[in-house]
Interface confidence: low
């Protein structure tokens, strides 16, 4: 007759924290007579999980009635799994002996891994705004996951970023882990509506990654471009000069007109036109009475944006 | 001695079309001697799926070697599953008899359901545009899914809608099913950038729902608001009157200026300013030579938008 084999069909079982884990084990024969036991780990330091013969194992239930005649199924279920239960479990057949039963054969083992989901990633950006062409840093953090293997990717408007550094802590074995990543993002003028996304993939998420986002509008300052032009006027003794302030972000802007270096008028931009890219435009005009001037006039449009140093553009108005 | 039990551990098994289905069955004893058979359905009309003793079953393979001494595992695998294979499968033990074997005991049955994915949902909107405060209907359709259980949700800009009617056809059993839903959406002035989303969740989609979208920009017409104002002018003999045409969609717009009811100028809007909400603004101005008028002048800004009836706003210009 073929010698008894101990079959543990699953090499590995992965269970979410809080669930029950079923560890399967079957014998191929009823002979030799003797009990089975389940252990976690192998060798001298192995931990008894279940003994068919004796003992109290409140979290363990058997899948079949082990006392039943002809039973060959010695599978067990362990309830309320925590990460501390991870390890390799062995189903071991003993042969009836005197005074003690003797270990006869062991199954190949089933590795139990315990899964815990990462927390929703939190993305934070720089404390102060930066201008286009400069690099800013964003951080992403997530905690409480197990196993340790995790993938973190950064995206800007759907395009994957590559300039980032990621750490998973702790380095050694732990009940759960944390991830921290810092990405460096180069700002462009069109980034007011841009978003950075931190995407985390983990075995517990079944292919549906967690994402944390941050808006670059909180991190960017786009300085305005100025254009001063003269508009046609039907009245001969008047000139209409406009200052087009274009593509700035955020809103805060103060404009001053100077005639030959002397302040003529100061305005705070209120009714702004928003561009498709999220930046703003504003236009101010100055009506100049040419009769009041004998010589040519230099008109200067001076703009202070978001508390930064003023920029200006001048226009020479010819008095003919 | 305990009597043999036929164990079918899974109450139900769900398989995707084209996959193999494993139906598990185990006996608790080697006695009595006799073959096992698998049937679909119960009673007189049941269909033989597999007979251990005889016959040719090309799509069926056994999981264990049934001829092996002491074998108690009578699980089978059926390849290339189609929706037509759905049903309840029974593992039945027969006792050797003469001339025929006699049915001894049946397992509790395993219900095999076959999964087929729904097609990508197609969303269509109304044939003609409607204005804000009016209700428009959107339809969503998806086909070819199984089982019949399916969830359909409607969203507008991420907010779930409740005013919709959904039907799944046919009402009775079928190889596959279709879903049709009609949602009623109240338009608002800010809906140019809005989207309606039809979201379908089904067991085959592994928690990743299918979505179909439609843009409300195809369904909405936002009529303009008009404002006529006089701008300050330093030149005494001229008045600058502007007509601000605000928040209209779609683009098509023609503006006519009338002085005391007589057409002064007609313009077609070209360079428009786009607002954050997707509507457009446009401004036209009229320079009026006040010297040419002895009495007050009524200036009228008349706008025809998107082929609709014209709207107008007048301004009384005082000639002092």
């Amino acid at each position: 007759e073929d010698e008894l084999q101990v079959i543990q069909p699953e090499k590995s079982v992965s269970v979410a924290a809080g669930e029950s884990a079923t560890l399967r084990c079957a014998m191929t024969s009823l002979i030799p007579v003797g009990p089975i036991m389940w252990f976690r780990g192998a060798g001298a330091g192995r931990e008894l999980i279940y003994n068919q013969k004796e003992g109290h194992f409140p979290r363990v239930t058997t899948v079949s009635e082990l006392t039943k005649r002809n039973n060959l199924d010695f599978s067990i279920s362990i309830s309320n799994i925590t990460p501390a239960d991870a390890g390799t479990y062995y189903c071991v057949k003993f042969r009836k002996g005197s005074p003690d039963d003797v270990e006869f054969k062991s199954g190949a083992g089933t590795e139990l891994s315990v899964r815990a989901k990462p927390s929703a990633p939190v993305v934070s950006g720089p404390a102060v705004r930066a201008t286009p062409e400069h690099t800013v840093s964003f951080t992403c953090e997530s905690h409480g996951f197990s196993p340790r293997d995790i993938t973190l990717k950064w995206f800007k408007n759907g395009n994957e970023l590559s300039d980032f550094q990621t750490n998973v802590d702790p380095a050694g074995d732990s009940v759960s882990y944390s991830i921290h990543s810092t990405a460096r993002v180069v700002l462009t003028r069109g980034d007011v509506h841009s978003q950075v996304i931190c995407e985390i993939a983990h075995i517990t998420l079944q292919g549906d990654p967690l994402r944390g986002t941050a808006n670059l509008s909180e991190a960017i300052r786009v300085p305005p471009t100025l254009e001063v032009t003269q508009q046609p006027m039907r009245a001969e003794n008047q000139a209409n000069v406009t200052c087009q302030v274009s593509n700035f972000y955020p809103r805060g802007l103060q404009l001053t007109w100077l005639e030959n270096g002397n302040v003529s008028r100061t305005e705070t931009a209120s009714t702004l036109i928003e561009n498709k890219d999220g930046t703003y435009n504003w236009m101010s005009w100055l009506l100049v009475n040419t009769c009041a001037h004998r010589d040519d006039v230099v008109l200067t449009c001076q703009v202070e944006h978001d508390g930064q140093q003023a920029v200006s553009k001048s226009y020479a108005l010819e008095i003919s | 001695e305990d009597e043999l039990q036929v164990i079918q551990p899974e109450k139900s098994v769900s398989v995707a079309a084209g996959e193999s289905a494993t139906l598990r069955c185990a006996m608790t004893s080697l006695i009595p001697v006799g073959p096992i058979m698998w049937f679909r359905g119960a009673g007189a009309g049941r269909e033989l799926i597999y007979n251990q003793k005889e016959g040719h079953f090309p799509r069926v393979t056994t999981v264990s070697e049934l001829t092996k001494r002491n074998n108690l595992d009578f699980s089978i695998s059926i390849s290339n599953i189609t929706p037509a294979d759905a049903g309840t499968y029974y593992c039945v033990k027969f006792r050797k008899g003469s001339p025929d074997d006699v049915e001894f005991k049946s397992g509790a049955g395993t219900e095999l359901s076959v999964r087929a994915k729904p097609s990508a949902p197609v969303v269509s909107g109304p044939a003609v545009r409607a204005t804000p405060e009016h209700t428009v209907s959107f339809t969503c359709e998806s086909h070819g899914f199984s089982p019949r259980d399916i969830t359909l949700k409607w969203f507008k800009n991420g907010n779930e809608l409740s005013d919709f009617q959904t039907n799944v056809d046919p009402a009775g059993d079928s190889v596959s099913y279709s879903i049709h839903s009609t949602a009623r959406v109240v338009l608002t002035r800010g809906d140019v950038h809005s989207q309606v989303i039809c979201e379908i969740a089904h067991i085959t989609l592994q928690g990743d729902p299918l979505r179909g979208t439609a843009n409300l920009s195809e369904a909405i017409r936002v009529p303009p608001t008009l404002e006529v104002t006089q701008q300050p002018m330093r030149a005494e003999n001229q008045a600058n009157v502007t007509c601000q045409v605000s928040n209209f969609y779609p683009r098509g717009l023609q503006l006519t200026w009338l002085e005391n009811g007589n057409v002064s100028r007609t313009e077609t809007a070209s360079t428009l300013i786009e607002n954050k909400d997707g509507t457009y603004n446009w401004m036209s101005w009229l320079l009026v030579n006040t010297c040419a008028h002895r009495d007050d002048v009524v200036l009228t800004c008349q706008v025809e938008h998107d082929g609709q009836q014209a709207v107008s706003k007048s301004y009384a210009l005082e000639i002092s």
Partner: antibody, heavy 117, light 108 residues
Framework: QIQLVQSGPELKKPGETVKISCKAS????????MHWVKQAPGKGLKWMGW????????TYVDDFKGRFAFSLEASASTAFFQINNLKNEDTATYFC??????????WGQGTTLTVSS | QIVLTQSPPIMSASPGEKVTLTCSAT???????LYWFQQKPGSSPKLWIY???NLASGVPARFSGSGSGTSYSLTISNMEPADAASYFC?????????FGGGTKLEIK
């Protein structure tokens, strides 16, 4: 232990079809993607694409769109790779490799395909 | 797509010698997604170094990896006959994933 076992060598004529299998064992098949890599004789490695073993959704590199198809039989923990309308330049060894969080940690032994008239 | 160029394509080294293989990318690659594989004739590739500098299971400590951005390298501190093989760098930082052309390392 974890293993990827591929089907045996194939000798085909131009215009024919071939289907290569890759059977996984020792881990939960649907937790890890499966990638396919081509190595022409005496040449380097070329990544062809991958299949999501949970959703069965394939992703192909531009050079391998059209005649190539990835598929699965998840219940048998097996991934497949098919080439239709074979050409001489398809002669190569094709590898399956496990993806996931540590890309390419396990590879199949390779399947040698020879296309010759 | 990111093209990975390995140099030199072929090199030979004496036992005990220090060897450095380089891998240069046409655009920046995340260090987390730069891997090295070893392949011997008639065998499938083996994961050798992952995430730029981590040795895969069973890889001798004489191997090390380093780099960032567009420039990466694999170093053997003292060459042994068992190290004779082809080494391929691989990025899966962005689609499509790509391999370098390989460096064939021979023993003198």
């Amino acid at each position: 232990q974890i293993q990827l076992v591929q089907s045996g060598p194939e000798l085909k004529k131009p215009g024919e079809t071939v289907k290569i299998s890759c059977k996984a064992s020792g881990y939960t098949f649907t937790h890890y993607s499966m990638h396919w890599v081509k190595q022409a004789p005496g040449k380097g490695l070329k990544w062809m694409g991958w299949i999501n073993t949970e959703t069965a959704e394939p992703t192909y590199v531009d050079d391998f769109k059209g005649r190539f198809a990835f598929s699965l039989e998840a219940s048998a923990s097996t991934a497949f790779f098919q080439i239709n309308n074979l050409k001489n330049e398809d002669t190569a060894t094709y590898f399956c490799a496990r993806g996931g969080l540590r890309q390419g940690d396990y590879w199949g032994q390779g399947t040698t395909l020879t296309v010759s008239s | 797509q990111i093209v990975l160029t390995q140099s030199p394509p072929i090199m030979s080294a004496s036992p005990g010698e220090k060897v450095t293989l380089t891998c240069s990318a046409t655009s920046s690659v995340s260090a987390s997604y730069l891997y090295w594989f070893q392949q011997k004739p008639g065998s499938s590739p083996k994961l050798w170094i992952y995430s730029t500098s981590n040795l895969a299971s069973g890889v001798p400590a004489r191997f090390s990896g380093s780099g960032s951005g567009t420039s990466y390298s694999l170093t053997i501190s003292n060459m042994e006959p068992a190290d004779a093989a082809s080494y391929f760098c691989h990025q899966w930082s962005s689609y499509p994933y790509t391999f370098g052309g390989g460096t064939k390392l021979e023993i003198k």
